[in-house]
């Protein structure tokens, strides 16, 4: 069964900077990745970035840079301009659309005890949906 993992990491050097890492474990080729926060895409979540493997990437504030790390994983850098960090308690969700499997989504957040530089373990709350 395909699986999506999500890691949320606070940057050690800049406490207001976070990175979301997502990956797809499974066969098939990825046709689109959507990253949202506050919940799954289309279910109360706000879209942060859309990444297409050939056509490029689109990101919206507070996303700073969306990148492909490998053919099946992406990273999204976030910049928190506020004094207090809303990202610390936020859920980030990644949805991978792949052929022929369909869409698979998973969410994760920064663990409450996270030290800067440490990432959440790759065991997110799974919201695995095959569309």
């Amino acid at each position: 069964t395909p699986e999506v993992w999500v890691q949320v990491q606070m940057e050690a050097t800049e406490l207001s900077s976070f990175t979301v890492h997502c990956g797809f474990l499974g066969p098939g080729s990825i046709s689109l990745v959507t990253v949202s926060w506050g919940g799954p895409d289309g279910a109360g979540g706000t879209k942060l970035a859309v990444l297409h493997p050939e056509l490029g990437t689109r990101q919206w504030a507070p996303a700073r840079q969306a990148r492909w790390e490998t053919q099946s994983s992406i990273s999204l850098a976030l910049e928190d301009s506020g004094a207090s960090s809303p990202f610390a308690n936020t859920t980030f969700c990644c949805k991978f659309a792949s052929f022929p499997e369909g869409s698979w989504e998973s969410c994760g957040s920064l663990p409450p005890s996270s030290d800067p530089g440490l990432s959440a373990p790759p065991t997110p709350v799974p919201i695995l949906r095959a569309d």
Partner: antibody
Framework: EVKLVESGGGLVQPGGSLKLSCVAS????????MSWVRQTPEKRLELVAD????????YYSDTVKGRFTISRDNAKNTLYLQMSSLKSEDTAMYYC???????????WGQGTLVTVSA | DIQMTQSSSSFSVSLGDRVTITCKAS??????LAWYQQKPGNAPRLLIS???SLETGVPSRFSGSGSGKNYTLSITSLQTEDVGTYYC?????????FGGGTNLEIK
Amino acid sequence: EVKLVESGGGLVQPGGSLKLSCVASGFTFNTYIMSWVRQTPEKRLELVADISNSGGNTYYSDTVKGRFTISRDNAKNTLYLQMSSLKSEDTAMYYCARPDNWDPFVYWGQGTLVTVSA
Amino acid sequence: DIQMTQSSSSFSVSLGDRVTITCKASEDIYARLAWYQQKPGNAPRLLISGATSLETGVPSRFSGSGSGKNYTLSITSLQTEDVGTYYCQQHWSTPWTFGGGTNLEIK
């Protein structure tokens, strides 16, 4: 035929405000991201702001963040750019432009000139 | 943001010349590059997208090439109507960014 018509430019003093409009026709407005691109007197092009088809997502360049607000009224097929705390470096020709999904700016308006000067 | 650099800001050329304009990105943009032509008093006009795809109505004397960080716009035989400023723009990663422009003028 796709048409984008900007209006609202003019001469304004530093610190002042201005609201630009762009009326779109010839396509289904509420299915496209829309953008404002400006061209400085030195002829440099800069993406100032863009907005998703529903208006739920926006982007602002660092040079205008916190001063400019992009919005849209899909019922009126109109894109807006509210500009406040204007600076002399905001002097430019402002174009309303439509990218084609993942493709670049296929359609541009004729532009509206904004001059910020005392 | 990805920086786009057009090394020549202007060229003085003769009619019939082959003209090559270059553009360099600060990182790989995977051939997601557009070229625009702008004539005085007009908005930019899209000529090429995806580094090589000519827009409808663009004369075949225009062509685009390149990959990775380096891209080229070529005009095989310069015509009077080709005079103007040419801009490159990456459309790989938002915010989309433009080069500084290369102005073509007749000698």
